[in-house]
């Protein structure tokens, strides 16, 4: 167990970066940082949690940007970022530092956050060592920071895996340094063979002297690369104490992408060219030259391997790499049950019967906004509408001039005459009524219950 500590020293425009803040003045804002740690030897998904831990800084002081003034180093939060780790410190790890800006203006729903810069580095670091300093560029921004890993007692060692507990036997296992630097906190280790190297030897039983990797000899004083056996490498021979010939760690150059190999005790180290990282320089940064933005997205930043890129997506696309088409139909823009079709360049609504308009917003079966011409009146009913037309007009919207006599409305041979307000039936002898529908009985009495006064059989009957 232990703690990874990160100290941010400054964040501002880098040399040759934008002389003014690339972010226009939008009122007061403040910075905060997020750190994420992942074991460096396992290529984990970015979507997976930060396996070694993560931490969020406090918010920095409020800062109001001046659009015309050169952007200074921005005011930072106080204190360290601390990421506790529970298990062993892996030695090689990925460090991801994100710089976030919090806008404090009058945003609906509270503050708005935007990611200003993101740096990802793979680093080699032993726990208990001194602070390591670093300067990273992300687009026009420059981030200066230091970091270290330290064990928390009772854990000790470069990986924080050895436990030094009072009142217990303190044994330093293979490959780990003895407890000498922390003897005050630890029980006395077993007494090793006299003269056994405190730095490179250890013992589990009194009187023995076992060597850490990279060291040999009876007292573990001889580095493997300069042993008395003519520089031959390999496991110790039990008979001679010499090394059996074996390949050197740099043989065949394990460093990829033009990295140069240098031997370390029992291992090797790669010095990587710019833009490459990892134990064997096998990992490279991603820049705008990689074409990381899809669907016409514009890549900014990321001009060199040490800076992050950001994709600005065109309308209709989203995602960190503009790889996702925005499902504009998910907003249900088509009203009244219309079917939404995203054609890419445009949105189309296929309307249900009775509806029209770009978004099916017009109800054709609705008298609201529906005009019946020539004095007709709109009548709703049964989910539809119709126009009741004034006399002399017909058609769906009462726009057609009607011949009132076309339908032969006068019964029993009555003659029809068009009239300005309708039609008039001139009935044949023996019939009467508006449409000559009633026969007149021989006694001169109509079949009508009562004839309107002043109406005689054979008179023309006006149809109102």
């Amino acid at each position: 167990a232990g703690v990874f500590e990160l100290q941010i020293h400054s964040f501002g425009p880098g040399p040759g970066g934008a002389p003014r803040s690339p972010y226009s003045a939008r009122g007061p804002c403040r910075l905060f940082f997020r750190v994420c740690l992942k074991p460096g030897l396992s290529e984990e998904a970015a979507e997976s949690p930060c396996a070694l831990g993560a931490a969020l800084s406090a918010r920095g002081p409020v800062y109001t940007e001046q659009p015309e003034a050169p952007a200074p180093d921005l005011p930072l939060p106080n204190g360290l970022l601390q990421v506790p780790f529970r298990d062993a410190w892996p030695g090689t790890f990925s460090l991801i530092i994100e710089t976030w800006r919090e806008e404090l203006g009058d945003q609906i729903g509270g503050p708005a956050w935007s990611l200003l810069a993101r740096v990802t580095r793979r680093r080699r670091l032993a726990a208990g060592g001194p602070w390591a300093g670093d300067i990273q560029r992300a687009g026009a921004w420059e981030l200066r920071f230091s970091y270290r890993a330290r064990c928390e007692l009772p854990a000790v060692g470069t990986a924080c895996t050895r436990l030094c507990r009072p009142r217990s036997a303190s044994r330093c296992g293979p490959g780990l340094r003895p407890c000498a630097p922390l003897e005050d906190e630890c029980e006395a280790p077993p007494v090793c063979r006299a003269g056994c190297s405190l730095e490179h030897g250890f013992c589990e039983q009194p009187g023995e002297c076992r060597c850490l990797e990279g060291w040999t000899g009876p007292l573990c004083m001889v580095p493997v690369s300069t042993s008395s056996c003519l520089g031959l490498r390999g496991p110790s021979s039990t008979t001679t104490g010499c090394l059996v010939p074996g390949p050197g760690p740099c043989d065949g150059n394990p460093c990829a992408n033009g990295g140069s190999c240098s031997e370390t005790p029992g291992s090797f180290e790669c010095t990587c060219p710019r833009g490459f990282y990892g134990l064997r320089c096998e990992v490279s940064g991603v820049t705008c030259a990689d074409g990381p933005c899809f669907n016409g997205g514009l890549c900014v930043g990321g001009a060199d391997p040490d800076s992050a890129y950001i994709c600005h997506c065109p309308p209709g696309f989203q995602g960190s790499n503009c790889e996702k088409r925005v499902d504009r139909c998910s907003l249900q823009p088509c009203r009244n049950g219309g079917l939404c079709l995203d054609l890419g360049h445009a949105l189309r609504c296929r309307c249900r019967a009775g509806f029209a308009g770009p978004r099916c917003e017009h109800d054709l079966n609705d008298c609201a906004g529906r005009a019946c011409a020539n004095g007709g009146t709109c009548v709703e009913g049964g989910g539809a509408h119709r126009c009741s037309c004034a006399l002399g007009f017909g058609g769906r919207d009462c726009r057609e001039r009607a011949d009132p006599c076309a339908a032969r409305p006068c019964a029993h041979g009555g003659r029809c005459y068009a009239h300005f307000s309708g039609l008039v039936c001139a009935c044949a002898p023996g019939y009467m009524g508006a449409r000559c529908e009633f026969p007149v009985h021989p006694d001169g009495v109509s079949a009508l219950p009562a004839a309107p006064p002043g109406l005689r059989p054979g008179d023309p009957q006006r149809y109102p």
Partner: nanobody
Framework: EVQLVESGGGLVQPGGSLTLSCAAS????????MGWHRQAPGKQRELVAN???????NYADSVKGRFTISRDNAKNSVYLQMNSLRAEDTAVYYC???????????WGQGTLVTVSS
């Protein structure tokens, strides 16, 4: 760590076709980009085509309409079908893999494509 193995390079006549394949192994995870870059003698390495695991693609203007990139996510593989090849397509073609949201990627060793009569 991700390992990339390319195949399919070789000598082809102008106007001919060739298909490059690249298989990724190791810790490949869902959201990633696989693609092809090329480096002609004396020139800088340039993007030819790439493809997001979600299906989006990019092509260099010089190869649009002639080259087609495709991938098989289940096999962690990417393919480049090269048609109507020209002498200027002669280069070492490198497979490229990188994870989304993690600005770290890997290169293959490269496979030589020579277009010559």
């Amino acid at each position: 760590e991700v390992q990339l193995v390319e195949s399919g390079g070789g000598l082809v006549q102008p106007g001919g076709s060739l298909t490059l394949s690249c298989a990724a192994s190791g810790s490949t995870f869902t959201s990633n980009v696989m693609g092809w870059h090329r480096q002609a003698p004396g020139k800088q390495r340039e993007l030819v085509a790439n493809m997001h695991s979600g299906g989006s693609t990019n092509y260099a203007d010089s190869v649009k309409g002639r080259f087609t990139i495709s991938r098989d996510n289940a096999k962690n593989s990417v393919y480049l079908q090269m048609n109507s090849l020209r002498a200027e397509d002669t280069a070492v073609y490198y497979c490229r893999w990188y994870g989304i949201q993690r600005a770290e990627g890997y290169w293959g060793q490269g496979t030589l494509v020579t277009v010559s009569s």
